[in-house]
């Protein structure tokens, strides 16, 4: 004969477990039902009566089948430097992200608690690491025959063009000067073309998601903390 | 609740070596952990630091260099290939935990790290 | 190091006498920084974090003020347990430490 179903809230077998999208309350010291996302328990279940839920307010949410008393706070608003990625729902958090031109600068759990503006190489220097969502742009000093005369947050150093008579020698901030017969371009060392966009190996060695959550506090100011500070702006 | 380093000792040049950070009393699965060093007579210096969901970040200058993995009471450092520039006592600490910044609050006493050939 | 530029490299002060350390950030850090006191043989002890909140067990003392790229480290009726030296840490995720104050307690 098949085992009679068991209606919550109900004693488990001695050393059993409850089942799925149930728990065990102390208290009661019966099997009783979560809450499904977007609601929580608003009374707890006894030895006679079940759990009873009840929606989450607003600006609060649940994600997860639960039995908590309150619904936890979505997270503050995006900051005007960030972008609202997900709305806060009653079974989801806020998502904000850094915006284009920023990264996160600090998170030690999913959420973003500090976006920083991208570090912008000065003159003379290029991008030897572009910037991801969490992690800066790196500079490096352009290599004999190679030059980058802008500030910027994505371009390489360049390789000088060749002349066949050099009117202005170029260096590490500027091109090359040909007198008037056409110039060719060299493939001096160091020049690499990484090509757009780039995906190169960033400061994590796991994939961290594009959206973070929205922290209770949201700091936003531009900040470079990447060590090679030589070739970058703001010093 | 305590932090230990271990497997310090002399190596030669290019011979990898594994630092062990081993913690009790402390669940890493809520806590974020680091490594730092620090050469005789110089400042501390960090090396990287591990997330609780696994993600780890390195100092520009170690990527590559070092590695940092978990098990449920370690945390260990490898030197992929040590030169006598990472003479140094190796640390290992617990960050403060929750969401802000990057605290440490509990280290171990350290482990001297030796590379010469 | 980081971009952490830590003064004075040394300082020594009377006992009862007050010390002021200061640290400076390459580029804004908003509050995101700890103070570390560490002395021969042993690891360093947290102190300060997000600028001026004391960590747990440490003496009222000890005070930290600043926000963006200036810090300041206030250690004021000093004592001989005082005599250490003193770390400014940058708490977002690329960590960076100054280059140490060295307190001499006479």
């Known amino acids: 004969l098949p085992a009679q179903v068991a209606f919550t809230p109900y004693a488990p077998e001695p050393g059993g477990t409850c089942r799925l999208r149930e728990y065990y309350d102390q208290t009661a010291q019966m099997c009783c039902s979560k809450c499904p996302p977007g609601q929580h328990a608003k009374v707890f279940c006894t030895k006679t009566s079940d759990t009873v839920c009840d929606s989450c307010e607003d600006s609060t949410y649940t994600q997860l089948w639960n039995w908590v008393p309150e619904c936890l706070s979505c997270g503050s608003r995006c900051s005007s430097d960030q972008v609202e990625t997900q709305a806060c729902t009653r079974e989801q958090n806020r998502i904000c992200t850094c915006r284009p031109g920023w990264y996160c600068a600090l998170s030690k759990q999913e959420g973003c608690r500090l976006c920083a503006q991208l570090r912008k190489c000065r003159p003379g220097f290029g991008v030897a690491r572009p910037g991801t969502e969490t992690s800066d742009v790196v500079c490096k000093p352009c290599a004999p025959g190679t030059f980058s005369n802008t500030t910027s947050s994505t371009d390489i150093c360049r390789p000088h063009q060749i002349c066949h008579v050099v009117a202005i020698p170029g260096n590490a901030s500027m091109d090359a000067v040909c007198t008037s017969t056409s110039p060719t371009r060299s493939m001096a060392p160091g020049a690499v073309h990484l090509p757009q966009p780039v995906s190169t190996r960033s400061q994590h060695t796991q994939p961290t998601p594009a959206p973070s959550t929205a922290p209770g506090t949201s700091f936003l100011l531009p900040v470079g903390p990447s060590p090679p500070a030589e070739g970058s702006t703001g010093d | 609740q305590s932090v230990e380093e271990s497997g310090g000792r002399l190596v030669t040049p290019g011979t990898p070596l594994i630092l062990t950070c081993t913690v009790s009393g402390i669940d890493l699965s809520n806590y974020a952990m680091g490594w730092f060093r620090q050469a005789p007579g110089e400042g501390l210096e960090w090396i990287g630091s591990?997330?609780?969901?696994?993600i780890t970040y390195y100092a520009n200058w170690a990527e590559g260099r070092f590695t940092i993995s978990r098990t449920s009471t370690t945390v260990d450092l490898e030197i992929t290939s040590p030169t006598t520039e990472d003479t140094a006592t190796y640390f290992c600490?617990?960050?403060?935990?929750?969401?802000?910044?990057?605290?440490?609050?509990?280290w171990g006493p350290g482990t001297l790290v030796t590379v010469s050939s | 190091a980081g971009d952490m530029t830590q003064t004075p490299a040394s300082v020594e002060v009377a006992v009862g006498g007050t010390v002021t350390i200061k640290c400076q950030a390459s580029?804004?850090?908003?509050?995101?920084l700890a103070w570390y006191q560490q002395k021969p043989g042993q690891p360093p002890k947290l102190l300060i974090y997000?600028?001026?909140k004391l960590a747990s067990g440490v003496p009222s003392r000890f005070s930290g003020s600043g926000s963006g790229t200036e810090f300041t480290l206030t250690i004021s009726d000093l004592e001989c347990a005082d005599a250490a030296t003193y770390y400014c840490?940058?708490?977002?995720?690329?960590?960076?430490f100054g280059g140490g104050t060295e307190v001499v307690v006479k």
């Open positions: 591990r997330r609780t969901d696994g």
């Open positions: 580029q804004s850090i908003n509050i995101y």
């Open positions: 600490g617990r960050d403060v935990g929750g969401d802000g910044g990057w605290y440490f609050n509990l």
């Open positions: 997000d600028a001026s």
């Open positions: 840490q940058q708490g977002i995720n690329n960590i960076g």
